[in-house]
């Protein structure tokens, strides 16, 4: 997260880190005791999932292996539409005050809505500085019409933009797949943005979760 702040401890109990070995690969969101939602571009053969701690690499955090992941069937490596994936944990998480599932959206929030995005991604760009603490940034949803002024045809129908006018605050390497939460519901998953990160008036682009609720529920049910 560029130009963010340290998240209030324990305020993001649904936030997970997808690790490759001990190294941060992507963020993710706990949606069920067996399931983590993340971006399709975060796919790996297997994952080490850290839950229940704001510190990356925390020895006291829950760490669960995941060997199965399910990309949205419409994910395109060319256009990056449908950049969403479910990761099935090999064993259920132990829910607690530090580990909770996020609330999936009942509706799509409108432009102007205040949201928070979080992650352990780099805080500087293009040179990288990875924080140990979970970082947050407060952003507002931007209309597709406004966002298309920047990204033109790169912006798909199920992509969501968020940012703050004239501000550098944004997501960056390592934040991918992490949550954009608005009014206590998951509205977005970090997908992409311009690079170097933090260029004012280049919004962060997210997968719009409200448009995938049926796919999420059906996929979890199919692979119970």
């Amino acid at each position: 997260i560029i130009d963010g702040y340290k998240c209030k401890e324990g305020s993001h109990p649904w936030q997970v880190a997808l690790l490759k070995g001990n190294q941060l690969h992507c963020g993710g969101v706990l949606v069920d005791k067996y399931w983590v939602l993340t971006a399709a571009h975060c796919k790996m053969g297997q994952y080490q999932v850290q839950l229940g701690s704001d510190k990356i690499g925390d020895q006291s955090a829950q760490k669960i292996k995941a060997t199965k992941s399910f990309r949205h069937p419409g994910y395109s490596t060319k256009t990056h539409v449908n950049d969403i994936m479910l990761v099935r944990l090999d064993e259920p998480v132990k829910m607690s005050s530090k580990v909770e599932a996020v609330q999936l959206p009942e509706h799509c929030e409108p432009p102007g809505t205040s949201c928070t995005v979080s992650g352990w991604g780099t805080t500087t760009s293009p040179d990288v500085t990875f924080p140990s603490d979970l970082m947050c940034s407060d952003v507002k949803l931007i209309s597709s019409r406004e966002c298309k002024k920047v990204y033109k045809d790169l912006l798909g129908k199920t992509m969501l933009c968020a940012g703050i006018p004239d501000s550098k605050t944004n997501t960056c390497n390592g934040d991918s797949g992490g949550p954009l939460v608005c009014n206590d519901t998951l509205q977005g998953l970090v997908s992409w943005g311009t690079y170097p990160c933090g260029q004012p008036n280049d919004p962060g682009v997210y997968t719009q979760v409200c448009k995938y609720k049926r796919w999420v529920m059906e996929t979890m049910k199919t692979h119970r």
Epitope: A39, K43, T77, P126, N173, D175, T194
Partner: antibody
Framework: QVQLVQSGAEVKKPGASVKVSCKAS????????IHWVRQAPGQGLEWMGS????????NYAQKLQGRVTMTTDTSTSTAYMELRSLRSDDTAVYYC???????????????WGQGTMVTVSS | DIQMTQSPSSLSASVGDRVTITCRAS??????LNWYQQKPGKAPKLLIY???SLQSGVPSRFSGSGSGTDFTLTISSLQPEDFATYYC??????????FGGGTKVEIK
Amino acid sequence: QVQLVQSGAEVKKPGASVKVSCKASGYTFTSEGIHWVRQAPGQGLEWMGSISASSGDTNYAQKLQGRVTMTTDTSTSTAYMELRSLRSDDTAVYYCARAAGYGARHWYFDLWGQGTMVTVSS
Amino acid sequence: DIQMTQSPSSLSASVGDRVTITCRASQSISSYLNWYQQKPGKAPKLLIYGASSLQSGVPSRFSGSGSGTDFTLTISSLQPEDFATYYCDQWYSTPPITFGGGTKVEIK
């Protein structure tokens, strides 16, 4: 230091295959994509394709589809490009390059290998 | 696929000259265009990304401009080490990434 180091020059006969390697160091290999670009003698640059080091997702240039395979070995931070059924017009310098960006999209090549000369001759 | 057309294909200039190279896209690519410099026997090197942003470590005599379909690379005062071939590429509609044909800058 941050670099991509490629394997040495190759001389191949028409119809043979070649496999070029590209070893990354100084950065997290799995966080970036590796692309392959070639340059025939005295000619311009031609994009061949790309691979995501973490997911293994590939995109190949249409004209090379079916003849090219890109792979990675994350344990050694190495990318490979294999080209089969070689023809004389495949004679070129082959470069690997790192794509800069984050998340699903990347925007430019910020790091290049030194190049590998592949000569196809009978 | 988007075609990138560079002009001129070659030019002769003297040290201290102002040099301008253009790149035209077959359709709008917004500002997702980059410029690279390549010297004989060497790999290309990034100069400008996003049409106008100078890559770290590149001298400020290099500048880029343009948006949509027409782009320009300018060298404000040509130095001896600038004699090389210059390429543009587009990352708007990818894959494929497409390159311009190159512009060779030679000593007059």
